[in-house]
């Protein structure tokens, strides 16, 4: 995240960091709690990195140097990456990790609400995102989970200062025209929230940007509620029943 | 499966014009980003141009800036390579390719993916 | 302009034996923004690697590549008949996108 501060335990107690551990162990992606046994993330987190084994899921954490070999971690039963992701096109980036165990829910572990499916005309206006990622484009992985409100900017603003790319309707944008604001390496996957009638609701997963926080370049992030069926289908055809916290 | 066939090259004179089309299929044409790549004879690779997937943003290689346009047909999933004021230089063979645009760490990525076999250009007189 | 230096122009080598390829750039590249293709006689290039070290679809594993900011390797832990050939780095981070003159991997 850049230009962003410092979370608070229990503040955004859906986001988890996904790490792989292979010879050493780094995180590599943030993630977002949907249900007892269900993380919503990014697809290309995924790349090249396909096999569950090697990914350990930390939960209700702040500090990444707090984890220890003794910290309790989550590990993946199931992948599931959307069916028309395609690791050479930047459309449908959003996979399903379905855990081998339920977690229980803590006041610094529990889920986040999905929007309605297809929501369009709610307009919000206070949105923050969240993650460990880089704090410059040429940064590192920052050890306490950072916070930044940005505000979205309309799909037909993002298509003007990405012109090489498609803003599809499945997509949204937050940023400032000036920049100095924004998710960055090591945020993909991560929450993109909005508050709204007193709830948080899961708007958007860190995609895309052009660099970081950069003038007149917003972050572009997959729109969950454009993939509510896939999500409703795909949870409830692996559980037998929904276990997702509902949506507003 | 992806396939790329370029045609139009041949021999022409120093001065003359040459159109090269590159014809797609396999692929949503309408929605990638396509490139021309050329190598001289016994040379490297050298990049000619691009072109994003609606053809609104173009760029060039210096060394064909203002006498080469690219263009495309997304209706008929053809790419095109305008060349003018053709020089003894740019005798090569001329490749489309097609540029892949995916997310790698919150980035896009860039590469070319797919390539066609190719079609020889020579500016001879 | 980026300028892409690799080095050796020419790697003689006997199959088996590892081959390491080296690229170089003027300024610093975003490490997804860099490919490595390999182009054997009367072929069109074939992309091998992308992103510095992803392999690209059906390429095998004795392919690997790394590297970050200026300097970037390509290794052929264990060269095969069909790996001879000559092999382009390239950069897409800023336009012009530019190539490598190529290394020329020949049979020892």
């Known amino acids: 995240i850049v230009g962003g501060t410092n979370s608070s335990w229990g503040e955004w107690p859906w986001q988890v960091s996904l790490q792989v551990k292979l010879t050493a162990q780094r995180h590599l992606c943030g993630g977002s709690l949907i249900g007892h046994q269900w993380v919503l993330t990014a697809a290309h987190c995924f790349d090249g990195l396909p096999l569950q084994d090697v990914w350990r899921i930390y939960s209700g954490i702040l500090n990444l140097s707090d984890i220890t070999k003794d910290t309790p971690f989550s590990q993946i039963k199931e992948i599931i990456i959307h069916q028309n992701y395609k690791v050479s096109e930047g459309n449908h980036d959003i996979a399903l990790i379905k855990l081998q165990a339920p977690l229980n829910y803590t006041e610094f572990q529990k889920p986040i609400c999905l929007p309605s499916k297809g929501d369009t005309s709610t307009i919000y206006t206070n949105c923050w995102v969240t993650g460990w990622g880089f704090s410059k484009e040429k940064g590192e992985i920052q050890n306490i989970l950072q916070k930044v409100n940005i505000p979205l900017v309309t799909n037909e603003e993002c298509q003007k200062r990405y012109q090489d790319y498609k803003i599809t309707q499945r997509m949204v944008c937050a940023g400032y025209k000036e920049g100095g604001k924004d998710a960055c390496k090591g945020d993909s996957g991560g929450p993109l929230v909005c508050k709204h009638n007193g709830m948080w609701r899961l708007v958007g997963i860190t995609s895309w940007g052009e660099g970081c926080a950069r003038r007149e370049q917003p972050g572009v992030y997959t729109k969950v509620a454009e993939y509510m069926d896939w999500i409703l289908e795909k949870t409830q055809s692996s559980d037998g029943k929904a276990q997702m916290q509902s949506p507003a | 499966e992806v396939q790329l066939l370029e045609s139009g090259g041949g021999l022409v004179q120093p001065g003359g014009s040459l159109r090269l089309s590159c014809a797609a299929s396999?692929?949503?044409?309408?929605?990638?980003?396509m490139v021309w790549v050329r190598q001289a004879p016994g040379k490297g690779l050298e990049w000619v141009s691009y072109?994003?997937?609606?053809?609104?943003?173009?760029y060039y290689a210096d060394s064909v800036k203002g006498r080469f346009t690219i263009s495309r047909d997304n209706s008929k999933n053809t790419l095109y390579l305008q060349m003018n004021s053709l020089r003894a230089e740019d005798t090569a063979v001329y490749y489309c390719?097609?540029?892949?645009?995916?997310?790698?760490?919150?980035?896009?990525?860039?590469?070319?993916?797919?390539w066609g076999q190719g079609t020889l250009v020579t500016v001879s007189s | 302009d980026i300028q892409m230096t690799q080095s050796p122009g020419t790697l003689s080598l006997s199959p088996g034996e590892r081959a390491t390829l080296s690229c170089r750039t003027s300024?610093?590249?975003?490490?997804?923004?860099l490919a490595w293709y390999q182009q054997t006689p009367g072929q069109a290039p074939r992309l091998l690697i992308y992103g510095a070290s992803s392999r690209a679809t059906g390429i095998p594993d004795r392919f690997s590549g790394t590297g970050y900011g200026t300097d970037f390797t390509l290794t052929i832990s264990r060269l095969e008949p069909e790996d001879y050939g000559t092999y382009y780095c390239q950069q897409s981070s800023r336009t012009p996108w530019t190539f490598g003159q190529g290394t020329r991997v020949e049979i020892k």
């Open positions: 072109i994003s997937p609606s053809g609104g943003n173009t």
């Open positions: 300024q610093f590249v975003n490490s997804n923004y």
């Open positions: 390719a097609r540029v892949a645009r995916g997310i790698a760490a919150r980035s896009r990525t860039s590469y070319f993916d797919y």
């Open positions: 396999g692929f949503t044409f309408s929605s990638q980003q």
